[in-house]
Interface confidence: low
């Protein structure tokens, strides 16, 4: 679709005569009829196949035509067409005299024609005007013409329809040849495909508008290059979505099982030494003067029963003081003024004289102790139970009631689920509070490393000389397919250079 435009510029009819030679009275009131048709080698009468247009009266005898004539006429004259411009044409321009106001052909006398010109030729679509001048014996017409495309039509023949748009169906403007030119940020044949944020991961990200980066399930981050770990993963990371690879010191499916309680929680107080002893379990070794599972209790100086021979201990700000019973003296009541004659041994203890009767020693029955067998044995005072075990006096002996996961006389042994080596194929076993976990070597998976998975034996690029590497899935080994001219299990030897073997 386009328009043939004709710009009339000047008409000269100095004598004011008609084509017949007869003069116009009082002058030639001139208007024009234009006929545009297909190319004819000899322009002949017949239908104006490309269109016709008429002007109003533009002037008398000789006159210049203004760019946009008043009186309803338009200059340039417009001859629209709605087909592909063929590139060739024929043009007939007739100048007529209008004696009255009725310009219809049937209202004019047959000899009202002033002049007639006919041209034909090639004309390419373009913005430039072609200037032409046609002269007859009595008249001269100067005019210019061109063909331009209608709005939204482009190309050499005005045959390419292109309407700029910026909506769901495309984001583009039109180039002079009718090709689309995408607006920045859009690409694709019809400029419907947004160009995502620079660096947006090609597989894991996408966008619905330019400079955007929306993440596919399992991915996050500005460029969708960070995986999302398994929901509930506490102390772990991922390299592919929904993984939970535990940080050091953590175990379990969600890496929420503390394998390094000492470091993560520092439970031991007052400078005690902490030792991990399994999942969420630890032992504190107290410094002198402290006691309790976490060494949180400060021992009074008297707690160690420093006073001998039934002496009573009194705490003081700077230490302690022993109040000795009759017959004893010394810092700890360790010196006796008694002998066996004084029956110093209590609770059925036997007295033995020493140093020729100057001193004595008591031999105590079971469950009693002290210089004079005056103390009942409390076998729990030394806090012998490890790992938070509870100490119980049971008559002549004591026993430890262990916390879950521990055993042994003193709860010193961790009940190990790993003791029976449950992890197959050389997997490493970790004891957890409520079970165990296997860390599998490369090539194995499953709860007990019982499932063989494929190892890519070609990952280390073992083949030389551009050989092709194949993985044998049944044996997890590689096979090298050598290019022409090379041999060897890794294609390492050129043909013709036999390998030098040591034998």
């Amino acid at each position: 679709s386009g328009v043939f435009q004709l710009q009339l510029q000047e008409f000269i009819n100095e004598r004011g005569v008609l084509a017949s030679g007869r003069p116009c009275e009082p002058g030639c009131r001139t208007f024009f009829r234009v006929c545009l048709k297909h190319f004819q080698a000899v322009v002949s009468p017949g239908p104006c196949t490309f269109g016709t247009v008429s002007t109003p009266v533009l002037g008398t005898n000789s006159f210049a035509v203004r760019d946009d004539s008043s009186g309803g006429g338009r200059n340039p004259l417009q001859l629209p067409f709605n087909f592909t411009w063929p590139g060739t044409f024929s043009l007939i321009i007739e100048a007529w005299h209008a004696p009255g106001d009725d310009l219809r052909p049937e209202a004019l006398p047959p000899d009202a024609l002033i002049s007639k010109i006919a041209i034909q030729g090639s004309l390419a679509v373009g913005q430039n005007w072609l200037l032409d001048e046609q002269t007859s014996t009595l008249t001269r017409l100067r005019y210019s013409y061109r063909v331009i495309c209608s709005d939204n039509y482009y190309g050499d023949n005005c045959s390419r329809l292109c309407k700029k748009r910026n909506d769901h169906f495309g984001h583009y403007v039109c180039q002079p040849d009718g090709n689309l030119s995408c607006l920045p940020g859009w690409t694709g044949e019809y400029c419907q495909q947004p160009i995502c944020l620079s660096g947006c991961h090609e597989q894991n990200g996408y966008c619905s508008k330019p400079a955007e980066c929306l993440c596919r399930p399992g991915w996050q981050g500005r460029l969708c290059n960070e995986c999302i770990p398994h929901n509930g993963c506490r102390h772990g990371t991922c390299s592919t979505p929904w993984q939970c690879t535990c940080d050091e010191g953590w175990g379990g499916l969600f890496c929420d099982q503390d394998l390094n309680y000492c470091t993560h929680h520092s439970p031991c107080k007052n400078g005690a030494t902490c030792s991990n002893s399994g999942q969420r379990s630890y032992t504190c070794t107290c410094r002198p003067g402290y006691t309790g599972v976490d060494c949180e209790l400060e021992l009074s100086e008297c707690d160690s029963n420093p006073c001998r021979n039934g002496g009573s201990c009194k705490d003081q700000e700077d230490g302690y003081h022993c109040l000795c019973p009759p017959g004893y003296y010394g810092l700890h009541c360790e010196h006796s003024t008694l002998s066996c004659a004084d029956s110093p041994c209590f609770n059925g203890g036997s007295c033995r004289e020493r140093n020729q009767g100057a001193n004595y020693a008591c031999e105590c029955p079971p469950n009693f102790t002290g210089s004079n067998c005056e103390k009942k044995v409390d076998r729990c005072t030394s806090n012998p139970c490890a790992n938070g075990g509870q100490c119980l006096n049971r008559g002549p002996s004591r026993m430890c009631r262990c916390r879950p996961g521990f055993t042994g006389t003193y709860c010193e042994l961790h009940v190990s689920d790993c003791a029976r080596n449950p992890c197959a194929h050389g997997g490493t076993c970790h004891d957890l509070e409520n079970g165990l976990m296997c860390t599998c070597p490369a090539g194995f998976s499953g709860r007990r490393c019982e499932v063989r998975t494929s190892i890519d034996a070609c990952a280390s690029s073992p083949c030389f000389n551009r050989a092709t590497c194949y993985t044998d899935l049944s044996t997890d080994t590689f096979v090298c397919n050598c290019p022409y001219g090379f041999v060897g299990s890794r294609c390492e030897f050129p043909v013709g250079l036999p390998p030098s073997f040591p034998w």
Epitope: Q175, N179, P184, W186, T187, S198
Partner: antibody, heavy 119, light 108 residues
Framework: QVQLVQSGAEVKKPGASVKVSCKAS????????ISWVRQAPGQGLEWMGW????????NYAQKLQGRVTMTTDTSTSTAYMELRSLRSDDTAVYYC????????????WGQGTLVTVSS | EIVLTQSPGTLSLSPGERATLSCRAS???????LAWYQQKPGQAPRLLIY???SRATGIPDRFSGSGSGTDFTLTISRLEPEDFAVYYC?????????FGQGTKVEIK
């Protein structure tokens, strides 16, 4: 006719910056993008990135990210490429080239700017 | 990143002979986004073929492009003296846009 004219040759010391200009004429500057391509001596062509003259949107090659900045001045129809922290392996001829948003080929090309990085 | 591998690296031919240059992509590329360029010593590259097979304005019809997917070919039907140069293929289907390493066509 459509033409891209680049600024003249530059000699720079390692660690310095260089800014190359590319002046466009003969077409509507904002309807197209400008891409930058470099060529080290005796080597092939390496794409550096593009900038939209329409809105300044950019896309840089990953290996140059953080060192390169591409800008445009629509009032003068000029594109600029700045490369910072220059190294000796940045010695190359730097070309600008026009491309259309749905036709990502380069036509025409600027005449090239030689940037030499040497201590 | 898509790697474009051109072969051969160098092609030694005489004027009048036919030249066939290959460009292989490491993954499938839409033909619309593959172009060929010619570069002569000391000059900027010049667009020859775009969209895998369309000749750029002013390029003689002895140059033709073909191919799709991962294999593309530039053919020069009869070499003229001015055709001896380096030829590069380029893809813009995926970012980063990449060039092949080039094929040098030299006089035998």
């Amino acid at each position: 006719q459509v033409q891209l004219v680049q600024s003249g040759a530059e000699v720079k010391k390692p660690g310095a910056s260089v800014k190359v200009s590319c002046k466009a004429s003969g077409y509507t500057f904002t309807y197209y993008g400008i891409s930058w391509v470099r060529q080290a001596p005796g080597q092939g062509l390496e794409w550096m990135g593009w900038i939209s003259a329409y809105d300044g949107n950019t896309n840089y090659a990953q290996k140059l990210q953080g060192r390169v900045t591409m800008t445009t001045d629509t009032s003068t129809s000029t594109a600029y490429m700045e490369l910072r922290s220059l190294r000796s392996d940045d010695t190359a001829v730097y070309y600008c080239a026009r491309y259309s948003w749905n036709k990502h080929w380069f036509d025409p090309w600027g005449q090239g700017t030689l940037v030499t990085v040497s201590s | 990143e898509i790697v474009l591998t051109q072969s051969p690296g160098t092609l030694s031919l005489s004027p009048g002979e036919r030249a066939t240059l290959s460009c292989r992509a490491s993954q499938s590329v839409t033909g619309s986004y593959l172009a060929w360029y010619q570069q002569k010593p000391g000059q900027a590259p010049r667009l020859l073929i775009y969209g895998a097979s369309s000749r750029a304005t002013g390029i003689p019809d002895r140059f033709s492009g073909s191919g799709s997917g991962t294999d593309f070919t530039l053919t020069i039907s009869r070499l003229e003296p001015e055709d001896f140069a380096v030829y590069y293929c380029q893809q813009s289907a995926f970012s980063p846009w990449t060039f092949g390493q080039g094929t040098k066509v030299e006089i035998k």
